[in-house]
Interface confidence: medium
């Protein structure tokens, strides 16, 4: 978790004074309780927004947007603090706004907005915004939370991201995968405009089970610059085993901007409706 | 050249778990799984499962389901298996394997004890 | 279960005799099985697999046959380093599973 660029935050808005600060995620308030507290936000949203760095790099960012409640407690809101929880790592970010000014009572509701937060595609997110002061021991919670789900490199917006087109999210390798004779497979896949290697999973299932019967690796070596966007024909050898007729081919590119973090790609063949009768297992069958 | 080395002899009380550890060295670990056999003493080889050391895909056998868990840290390209709840007739040697049907390399073995 | 019968379960027999073992699966494994020689004290040695494909350094003196529900390891000639146990394995279907093992002992 990060914020875009270390440019300077700006909470500040007609009628407000406000700067935006680091936080440790924990308000001197809650080691000091104050008497009068602020209510909680009001209709906390969340979305995917997309913002450019300095240096022009595209990030997809969480856009938070929340108002206040219409009630007296704004007299002692002093600012809030937004938190960013990573839902599978617990790793977790917070600012503090921090009001320099009183806030009034005016024509409109108060709007506060912040788009800073770096966000990672497929990932889940808890965000919550704190009113400060925080309220003393067993007073009514004065925060709202809600989780954010972030969208995979597939999503249109996002594969123009950079860290989806870092991970190869712009490689689009159309894979066929076609049965022969002789328990094998053919997979056909388009290879990307780099000279770096592949690397082929084939995992087999039975019919309606998930556990694999069968996983096998096949290493393809780094093209040639005139073999970019050519087609790559591989032909892989099954293992005759028992009701073990599903296939999953998996493709795992390792570009030079991602290494062993790359997307991988998929494609799956089902069982026949009416599986052949098992042939013998030539005897020049390589060991897997 | 290609080696398993597993973990010391280990002794357990009824009840108890156990993990034993596989470090592989010679060879690209994710490119084969590694399979897990046992073997009492006086008696013979009993297959207890295996795990994909590239996918994280396991295949365990049926009388060990629930009780025992197969990973591995492709940092360290080590493979473990944990067995819990153990019994006295839980006390063999277990051994790792490399290669999910036909195991072409083995580790030394792990003598697992388990008495009160 | 496939369930995998080695027979005989002891063989005695003297150095540089041939010594024959049998394997029996009580369904068709096809052509999905290795034999493996187990030493006290050691870990199992893989010697062939594919029911007759020599593993990495096995010397020509083992050879496998068969396929389907009967396999046949042969030792040409019994040199002393080969009194061992020797274990049969399928792999055609899950779970996998070893035959008792054939004790190879000198006559």
């Known amino acids: 978790l990060r914020l875009l660029d270390h440019r300077a935050l700006v909470c500040s808005q007609p009628g407000l004074n406000c700067t935006v600060k680091n936080s440790t995620c924990l308000d001197d308030s809650w080691i000091h309780p104050r008497n009068l507290t602020p209510s909680s936000p009001k209709d906390l949203q969340i979305q995917l927004h997309f913002a450019h760095t300095q240096q022009g790099d595209l990030f997809p960012v969480a856009h938070i947007e929340w108002t206040l409640q219409t009630d007296a407690s704004i007299l002692y809101l002093e600012g809030a603090e937004l938190s960013v929880l990573q839902l599978n790592t617990n790793e977790r970010l917070c600012v503090r706004f921090e009001f320099l000014s009183k806030l009034r009572h005016h024509h409109r509701r108060w709007r506060f907005t912040f788009s800073h937060f770096v966000v990672d595609p497929d990932q889940e997110y808890e965000v919550t915004v704190h009113h400060l002061p925080k309220p003393i021991p067993d007073g009514d919670p004065n925060h709202q939370s809600k989780n954010f789900l972030v969208p995979d490199c597939e999503h249109a917006r996002m594969k123009v991201t950079t860290p989806c087109m870092s991970s190869g999210s712009l490689w689009d390798p159309n894979i066929t995968v076609e049965t022969l004779e002789a328990h094998q497979l053919r997979v056909s896949f388009t290879l990307w405009n780099e000279s770096t290697h592949y690397q082929i999973l084939l995992t087999s299932f039975p019919h309606m089970e998930n556990h694999s019967c069968f996983e096998h690796m096949h290493h393809i070596p780094a093209p040639r610059p005139e073999e970019f966007h050519q087609r790559s024909n591989v032909t892989l050898t099954l293992r005759n085993l028992k009701g073990c007729c599903r296939h999953q081919v998996q493709i795992q590119p390792f570009f030079s901007s991602c290494l062993n973090d790359c997307l991988r790609h998929s494609a799956t063949v089902s069982c026949p409706e009416m599986p052949d009768t098992p042939e013998p297992i030539p005897d020049y069958m390589p060991l897997w | 050249q290609v080696q398993l080395v597993q973990s010391g002899a280990e002794v357990k009380k009824p009840g108890a778990s156990v993990k034993v550890s596989c470090k592989a060295s010679?060879?690209?670990?994710?490119?084969?799984?590694i399979s897990w056999v046992r073997q009492a003493p006086g008696q013979g080889l009993e297959w207890m499962g295996w795990i994909s050391t590239y996918s994280g895909n396991t295949n365990y056998a049926q009388k060990l389901q629930g009780r025992v868990t197969m990973t591995t840290d492709t940092s360290t390209s080590t493979a473990y298996m944990e067995l819990r709840s153990l019994r006295s007739d839980d006390t063999a040697v277990y051994y790792c394997a490399r290669r999910q049907l036909y195991f072409d390399y083995w580790g030394q073995g792990t003598l697992v004890t388990v008495s009160s | 279960e496939i369930v995998m019968t080695q027979s005989p379960a002891t063989l005695s027999v003297s150095p540089g005799e041939r010594a024959t073992l049998s394997c029996r699966a009580s369904?068709?494994?096809?052509?999905?099985l290795a034999w493996f020689q187990q030493k006290p004290g050691q870990a199992p040695r893989p010697l062939i697999y594919d029911a007759s494909t020599r593993a990495t350094g096995v010397p020509a003196r083992f050879s496998g046959s068969g396929s389907g529900t009967d396999f046949t390891l042969t030792i040409s000639s019994l040199q002393s380093e080969d009194f061992a146990v020797y274990y049969c394995q399928q792999y055609d279907n899950w779970p996998l599973t070893f035959g008792g093992g054939t004790k190879v002992e000198i006559k």
């Open positions: 369904q068709s494994v096809s052509s999905n």
């Open positions: 010679g060879y690209t670990f994710t490119r084969y799984g």
